[in-house]
Amino acid sequence: EPCVEVVPNITYQCMELNFYKIPDNLPFSTKNLDLSFNPLRHLGSYSFFSFPELQVLDLSRCEIQTIEDGAYQSLSHLSTLILTGNPIQSLALGAFSGLSSLQKLVAVETNLASLENFPIGHLKTLKELNVAHNLIQSFKLPEYFSNLTNLEHLDLSSNKIQSIYCTDLRVLHQMPLLNLSLDLSLNPMNFIQPGAFKEIRLHKLTLRNNFDSLNVMKTCIQGLAGLEVHRLVLGEFRNEGNLEKFDKSALEGLCNLTIEEFRLAYLDYYLDDIIDLFNCLTNVSSFSLVSVTIERVKDFSYNFGWQHLELVNCKFGQFPTLKLKSLKRLTFTSNKGGNAFSEVDLPSLEFLDLSRNGLSFKGCCSQSDFGTTSLKYLDLSFNGVITMSSNFLGLEQLEHLDFQHSNLKQMSEFSVFLSLRNLIYLDISHTHTRVAFNGIFNGLSSLEVLKMAGNSFQENFLPDIFTELRNLTFLDLSQCQLEQLSPTAFNSLSSLQVLNMSHNNFFSLDTFPYKCLNSLQVLDYSLNHIMTSKKQELQHFPSSLAFLNLTQNDFACTCEHQSFLQWIKDQRQLLVEVERMECATPSDKQGMPVLSLNITCQMNK
Amino acid sequence: QKQYWVCNSSDASISYTYCDKMQYPISINVNPCIELKRSKGLLHIFYIPRRDLKQLYFNLYITVNTMNLPKRKEVICRGSDDDYSFCRALKGETVNTTISFSFKGIKFSKGKYKCVVEAISGSPEEMLFCLEFVILHQPNSN
């Protein structure tokens, strides 16, 4: 069975084809090759000599037991080598020779028992080494690591490392890898020698499900003293053994680390005293809790020095009390409990993501809701009912505003966005908005992107609501049940490049409303009910137009519409997916491609 | 279509079939077997995925006695610092995991429950596997 040609001459997918040897019928130009799940078993010297351009090679689960010297010799362009799930028993010293451009080596679940005799010391270009799910017992980083000066990611998770000693990291003292991210999760750790991490600098350290008791956790974290780490991730996994007890003493040792960003990821334990628990983390710049349950929500009003707070997938009794002077970014997403938003006091806040919480807002939105006048980014998407009761007074700095899939109330009662002259991006898609007021978008003089799909208009008619949006480049009006539009609806949109009118209820096409759209490149009218043209004579669309989508409409392929069908043929160079432009009537022509019709009408007269 | 039996409990019988062409082997055990009136137990899965499990989600299509419920999407792996350790599993890596579950206080009517589980993962998204579970529910007289 042949390999699947994914990208001709470049990418080949040969997965699970029962190959016992490497295929030699693929082009020399192959750059990406997936040979996974084939019983190759043995890689001899120069096994891939016929793939001189290869960049990515996937050998996952190929039952490989032996890799000989120079197996990959000649692959000087190879950047990624994946060996996951091979029961390697014999790895020659020169197994990886010739891989002068290798950046990523994945040797997960390969029976690797030690880093010491893993022959990769010459791979100077290596950026990522993943040796997770192996049998490694010692965390001693061999001397050859001093050659791996580009290493950025080392994944040692799910191994058998129990202890870390001062000597294990000696090589890092000799050549500080300023950018190294280290994952030690799921190693059964019980001892870290104090001083082992002294004056070590890491970009990221991840320790999840490493400790089987609170005491072990406490002493191991104390053993991290002296570490300078940009991002520290602690926590557990839901499907692994969890700590029976967790209290403030667990994290006391963090006072002896220098941490820029901290994250606690999943804890099967109720956190009741955040102030004491995170006492050593008051001055990290970014603080993040993922999948934890928080009892006392008032604690977030303590004077933490965080600039970025992230609360994701957590459980709260009620919406937390947030009073944080220095906070610039707040991400509060996919949380449960506390369904009603309550005011926060965050005077420095510039970025606020409150999406996917099922929150309801009694009144939105003004400076008093968020306690800031600096807000530039606000995401309230995928929430509950949001009642618009103020038009963003004090929030004039906003540049990005997203309400999609929330239920907006009182949108047509006043000019909701009047203050937002700096707004560039607005998404009110699927917000149950019924446009009944022409001044709905007044004030949005800088707006470039407007997404309002899945809403509705009074009498299914699009009025002149865009008159002030002179900078608009993208407009989505799909799924709005529109049947008609004002001939001057788009007259002021001279910068508009993309207009999506798909999935509406238009029965005829008219070029007149688009005459002023001098920058229009894409016009999508798919999934309407277009049968014919509105006027007998259709003019041309703007000369800038490059893509016109008229697919899945109800074209009437009869003589009375001959001029319209001819006009469509004349637009052939603009049309996309022409094979999906089919006749709907008459019944004898149903399903026929519109462009293949020979429109001579004498026969039917 | 071969049917794979999972387990029987006092009020339910659970089995599954594959609803995809690939039919890559997957081993599923539930201990103790699910009782629909209330249940607490462990789900054990042994599986070798054909793609990375990063950004894994399930599309669930549930049918109750021939009545179709709306499609439901359950995100399991968001993509970074996920709740489950198997979210970091790579294509070809053995996934051998036990997940605890519990639910109570749901009253189910007697009959045949079908649940098609489409597992989607990776970037670009592709189907990982598709299983159709059948639960025959015989409520006790109480």
Epitope: K21, I22, D24, N25, F28, L43, G44, S45, Y46, S47, F48, F49, S50, S74 | -
Partner: nanobody, 112 residues
Framework: EVQLVESGGGLVQAGESLRLSCVVS????????MGWYRQAPGKQGESVAI???????YYPDSVKGRFAISRDNAKNTVYLQMNSLKVEDTGVYYC????WGRGQGTQVTVSS
């Protein structure tokens, strides 16, 4: 036991030609992808010519139009015709059987 014996190397002036031969014993080459690989001191090794069983060939840009690989399955031999040689073509040239290995190599030195 499979053996590959290269010959034909030597010292030449820039612009001259050489023809390398590789005689294989212990295995039939008719079903094997064959090629030549060169290693210059202090430089990254590179494939200079590959020939498949159907006769299709590959050359990197650095030798394209100057080098030509051919095979004689009856004689179990592979050849590399090198024309318009340049100083940067200097190195040890190894005959390769994909998946099996290489010979001892033959030295090619091109002087200016």
């Amino acid at each position: 036991e499979v053996q590959l014996v290269e010959s034909g190397g030597g010292l030449v002036q820039a612009g001259e030609s050489l023809r390398l031969s590789c005689v294989v014993s212990g295995i039939s080459i008719s079903t094997k992808v064959m090629g030549w690989y060169r290693q210059a001191p202090g430089k990254q090794g590179e494939s200079v010519a590959i020939i498949k069983t159907d006769g299709s060939t590959y050359y990197p840009d650095s030798v394209k139009g100057r080098f030509a690989i051919s095979r004689d399955n009856a004689k179990n031999t592979v050849y590399l015709q090198m024309n318009s040689l340049k100083v940067e073509d200097t190195g040890v040239y190894y005959c390769i059987i994909t998946g099996w290995g290489r010979g001892q190599g033959t030295q090619v030195t091109v002087s200016s």
